[in-house]
């Protein structure tokens, strides 16, 4: 799978976690940090 | 299936200020970016700014800054941009798209015709 | 603001013709354009994002390329059906569209 950094516009799009783009799959992608999920690493769920 | 549903057509007097809508359904807007568009008749498409509806911050073209204000009702998965003080060149189509996880996504588009 | 700047404005050209339409961007969008195909009455319809990766049901005679601040986007060969106004966006620093290519039949 490529991947690529996310475009400056989602500077701040993931809440707790980093930005990825697929580039296979035309999406941006939150890789949340440890404890956090949802769409943006919004959510904290320990 | 995702959607967004834009209010009707407006027609209004120069000075005035409106209010369009968007209604999106089939997503959460919280997961996304709201930017609006808009195209003047026989112009070209032109980007005016964007909210992100989860922290609630916004950006604005400079030349719009301080006419335009977007904001998001997130209870009814609503965006919205008003724009004020309005003169007959702002007489165009203004979209909202979905943008954020997925690429841009339209509305429909309302028609704001400024007349006297 | 990033400012793209397409041409050319309009061009004439033949069935079967190829096609080439530039966007100049003010600086490096990392390859952050998309293309957009946009009929007289109808919202744009998005053709290609990320330089060169074709939306669903989009005919393989449209393509795009380029890197830095240079992009291309190319119908090979030019259809009826291709008439109409193209637009670039740059979306890697907020977003800035060119201006436009009226695309029409010689």
């Known amino acids: 799978v490529s991947i690529t950094k996310c475009n400056s516009d989602m500077n701040g799009y993931c809440l707790h976690g980093q930005c990825i783009y697929l580039v296979d799959m035309s999406q941006n992608y939150c890789r949340c940090e440890v404890g956090y999920t949802g769409v943006r690493c919004e959510h904290f769920y320990l | 299936q995702d959607q967004l549903v834009q209010s009707g057509a407006e027609v209004k007097k120069p000075g005035a200020s409106v209010k369009v809508s968007c209604k999106a359904s089939?997503?959460?807007?919280?997961?996304?970016?709201i930017q609006w568009v808009r195209q003047a008749p026989g112009q070209g498409l032109e980007w005016m700014g964007r909210i992100d509806p989860l922290r609630r911050n916004t950006k604005y073209r400079e030349k719009f800054e301080g006419r335009v204000t977007i904001t998001a009702d997130t209870s009814t998965n609503t965006a919205y941009m008003e724009l004020s003080s309005l003169r007959s060149e702002d007489t165009a189509v203004y979209y909202c798209?979905?943008?954020?996880?997925?690429?841009?996504?339209w509305g429909q588009g309302t028609l704001v015709t400024v007349s006297s | 603001d990033i400012q793209m700047t397409q041409s050319p404005s309009s061009l004439s050209a033949s069935v079967g013709d190829r096609v080439t339409i530039t966007c100049k961007a003010s600086?490096?969008?990392?390859?952050?354009i998309a293309w957009y195909q946009q009929k007289p009455g109808q919202a744009p319809r998005l053709l290609i994002q990320y330089t060169s990766t074709l939306q669903p049901g989009v005919p393989s005679r449209f393509s795009g390329s380029g890197s830095g601040t240079d992009y291309t986007f190319t119908i090979s060969s030019l259809q009826p059906e291709d008439i109409a106004t193209y637009y670039c966006?740059?979306?890697?620093?907020?977003?800035?569209f060119g201006g436009g290519t009226k695309v029409e039949i010689k």
């Open positions: 966006l740059q979306y890697d620093n907020l977003r800035t």
């Open positions: 600086q490096d969008i990392h390859k952050y």
């Open positions: 798209v979905r943008s954020g996880r997925l690429f841009d996504f």
């Open positions: 089939g997503f959460n807007i919280k997961d996304t970016y």
